[in-house]
């Protein structure tokens, strides 16, 4: 017997799709060897139609895929737009030739079934409405009209013109005539459920002179759309349920054994397992909406359904749309930290991966907010101004070609705790969710700036020092001037660097920056930080006020400006942590209204197109001492 296993017989109808799963023994060789799907010919030769090596035959072009799931020891062959010509014998198998390990699969594709001439076939999806048309002769114009459903030999009345309605069709069935028509009546059945399927008979009149019509009603469960996504990537469920439910609450649920558990709905319900990584966005006034989930995990795989009902919960007989999500563990998206920890007054440096092939894409960082359907307003971007409330403490450092950019947030407060998203206007799969946890500081900060009340006088020399501990001895120290388009590195002087590392004196490790002479435009936020190559570490910020020599009052009270920076920062901004639940997420609708519209986020900053280059000191009056 072959160790490969799959469905022996697959049957479908023209125009449909099939997904054939083949199971193989879990060995390293099997996981990585070629997978194939071939058609058995009369001559015994099996002609390859598709393989995991990238081969795709002409007859399968644009309608088939083969996906390997090594973690499950399975591979799936999807074939769409079936025709009767696809009927035949096939093999799914493993190996460099089509004579290796295989399993025989018989595929039969039939024509869409036909019914007797007098039977009208109605095909509707669950939750929709069917209108059954019933014709009659003039002689029965004033006779009783009815619709019954065949159950074995009997035909049970569903509704009739005497206003009788079967209890199971109450509030769902109506019998009516249109305009002045004298030879046709109609029956509407709404909120269709699977048990409504079957053969119906319309009747006008009684006895042998009665006019009868047969109607075959097929109520279809939604065919799930198959979605294949990589681990840590994102998925968007596009839901279009039609105008008739435009004003009802919408939901996305995940099917389990007994029920469909709501993940998110427009009434504010959200599943905690998706905290910080899910977003529901209305698309238009016709009831279309989308749900975006980022940071996909293996356990996110499964069956999803979107629907509409005033309760925001799944309800039998209401329209639904379905998907089956597969999460492939062989992901191109690197594993990045999902929880970053900081302390009040301290800083965090968050590394955001992006598709290295898209180094010129615009980079963004947004804060997920849990109100209503969730949103994620952009806080900073390569061409977006830093949002109000984050001036002087937030910067994005792009590192072109490295496949990552860094976002630094300092002067942390407990209000900064929450979920943040890294995203670009390029490959929409590369969206990562970070949970920032800010705890109260329990010790002095590692980086300290003196003087703390920094007021410089125009025309004079002003020096500011940053004290760092010995643990930062080998790291690069820098000063930068913060502006809305980044933090521009300044020349600085490291006074601790002259000592040998063996005799590091904790008290004399200083990196200083001098403004000589001080100009009015030197006023603003300055950061002292440490980094190793492209890896940014801790930072601290100080506001430097600039005043005229003659005036006594500074432009801004530096004590107030620096208040945020005085709390003791963290010991280790990004201590390693286990992956923790990242919950509800929702983004700025302008970013997520459509996968293609993310570039519009840059429009916030039309007047400021400079990018925050962390390596530039241009335009600054800082100089080395």
């Amino acid at each position: 017997q072959s160790p490969i296993f799959g469905p022996q017989d697959v049957s479908s109808i023209e125009g449909n799709s099939v997904s054939i799963t083949c199971y193989y023994p879990d060995t390293s060789v099997n996981r990585h060897t070629r997978k194939y799907w071939c058609r058995q010919g009369a001559n015994g030769y099996c002609a390859t139609l598709i393989s995991s090596n990238g081969y795709l035959s002409k007859e399968y072009s644009g309608r088939a895929s083969l996906i390997n799931f090594p973690e499950n020891s399975t591979f799936v062959i999807n074939i769409a737009h079936l025709t009767q010509e696809d009927t035949g014998s096939y093999k799914c198998g493993l190996g460099t030739t089509n004579r290796g390990l295989f399993f025989d699969v018989s595929l039969e594709v039939s024509q869409v079934p036909e019914f007797p001439n007098d039977t009208h076939v109605y095909t509707k999806d669950i939750g929709r409405t069917v209108t059954i048309e019933c014709r009659f002769k003039e002689g029965n114009a004033h006779s009783k009209k009815s619709l019954c459903k065949k159950r074995g030999e009997a035909c049970e009345v569903v509704i009739d013109s005497t206003e009788y309605v079967d209890p199971s069709y109450k509030d769902r069935a109506i019998l009516f005539m249109k305009g002045t028509s004298r030879d046709i009546f109609y029956v509407n059945i709404s909120h269709l459920i699977p048990s409504d399927a079957g053969l119906y008979v319309c009747q006008a009149g009684e006895g042998p002179s009665a006019d009868k019509n047969n109607a075959d009603l097929q109520v279809l469960e939604p065919e799930p759309e198959l979605l294949y996504k990589d681990l840590r990537s994102s998925v968007t469920f596009e839901c279009d349920l039609g105008r008739e439910v435009a004003n009802d609450a919408k939901y996305l649920c995940r099917k389990n054994k007994e029920t469909c558990d709501v993940i998110i709905n427009t009434l504010g319900k959200r599943d905690p397992a998706f905290e910080g990584r899910i977003l529901l966005t209305p698309r238009d006034d016709n009831g279309r909406f989308s749900v975006l989930i980022t940071g996909l995990r293996k356990e996110d795989a499964g069956h999803y359904q979107c629907g509409a009902h005033s309760s925001g919960l799944p309800q039998e007989g209401w329209p639904v749309q379905a998907w089956q999500l597969f999460v492939n563990e062989e992901s191109t998206i690197p594993n990045s930290r999902s929880v970053v920890k900081g302390v009040t007054g301290g800083s965090v440096a968050i590394v955001c991966p992006y598709n290295p092939k898209e180094s010129s894409s615009l980079k963004y960082w947004c804060h997920w907010e849990a109100d209503e359907n969730g949103r994620c307003p952009v806080l900073v971007g390569t061409q977006a101004l830093v949002q109000e409330g984050y001036e002087g403490r937030l910067a994005l450092f792009d590192q072109p070609g490295s496949g990552a950019y860094t976002v630094i947030l300092n002067q942390l407060t407990t209000q900064d705790s929450g979920f943040y998203w890294c995203l670009t206007d390029g490959d929409s799969r590369w969206r990562t969710t970070i949970e920032l946890q800010v705890a109260e500081a329990t010790k002095k900060p590692d980086l300290e700036v003196t003087p703390q009340n920094a007021t410089a006088v125009i025309g004079e020399t002003f020096t500011i020092s940053c004290h760092y501990p010995c643990k930062f001895y080998s790291q690069e120290k820098y000063w930068c001037k913060w502006s809305n388009d980044g933090c521009h590195i300044l020349p600085s002087h490291d006074e601790g660097a002259r000592q040998s590392s063996v005799s590091c004196d904790q008290s004399s490790q200083i990196v200083s920056m001098t403004l000589n002479p001080v100009k009015k435009e030197d006023e603003g936020w300055y950061w002292c930080g440490v980094k190793e190559g492209q890896v940014y570490g801790e930072t601290t910020a100080i506001y430097v006020a600039v005043e005229e020599r003659t005036r006594g009052s500074p432009h801004i009270n530096p004590t107030d400006a620096n208040a945020r920076a005085k709390d003791a920062p963290e010991e280790e901004a990004m201590e390693s942590s286990v992956r923790e639940d990242e919950n509800k997420a929702n983004l700025d609708p302008r970013l997520f209204a459509d996968e293609r519209e993310i570039q519009n986020a840059g429009d916030q900053a039309q007047e400021n197109r400079a990018s925050g280059n962390a390596g530039s000191a241009g335009g600054q009056s800082g100089s080395s001492k």
Epitope: F5, D9, P194, L220, H303
Partner: nanobody, 130 residues
Framework: EVQLVESGGGLVQTGGSLRLSCAAS????????MGWFRQAPGKEREFVAA??????????YVGDSVQGRFTISRDAAGNTVYLQMNSVKPEDTAVYYC?????????????????????WGKGTLVTVSS
């Protein structure tokens, strides 16, 4: 509450045929997959056959030991599944259990694994005499 009721078991001679039925009932229970497993005294539960459907597409799976002899089918409504047993052998003697799934599972889940089935019947005994 979902119920699976097997019928059709009994005594049959070697080489003979038997047809087992399994009816699923329960308000709004609309199964997505149904299957048959069997258990002989002192042995583990063994996969016999399964049928899975999605819209107008049907997938049939058959266990190695019954390949070419047993076939699985279902009625048009999808709530009853049949196991046609032909050319039976003494080693086919076992209690035959019906299984059902209401939720479409990830298609990478192996139908041969009893743990991945949600609902089970009480079983029907098939005895093959030589």
């Amino acid at each position: 509450e979902v119920q699976l009721v097997e019928s059709g078991g009994g005594l049959v001679q070697t080489g003979g045929s038997l047809r087992l039925s399994c009816a699923a009932s329960g308000r709004t229970f609309s199964p997505y997959a149904m299957g048959w497993f069997r258990q002989a005294p002192g042995k583990e539960r063994e996969f016999v056959a399964a049928i899975r459907w999605s819209g107008a597409t049907t997938y049939k799976y058959v266990g190695d030991s019954v390949q070419g002899r047993f076939t699985i089918s279902r009625d048009a409504a999808g709530n009853t599944v049949y196991l046609q047993m032909n050319s039976v052998k003494p080693e086919d003697t076992a209690v035959y259990y019906c299984a059902a799934d209401r939720v479409p599972k990830d298609i990478s889940i192996d139908p041969r694994n009893p743990k991945d089935w949600d609902y089970w019947g009480k079983g029907t005994l098939v005895t093959v005499s030589s």
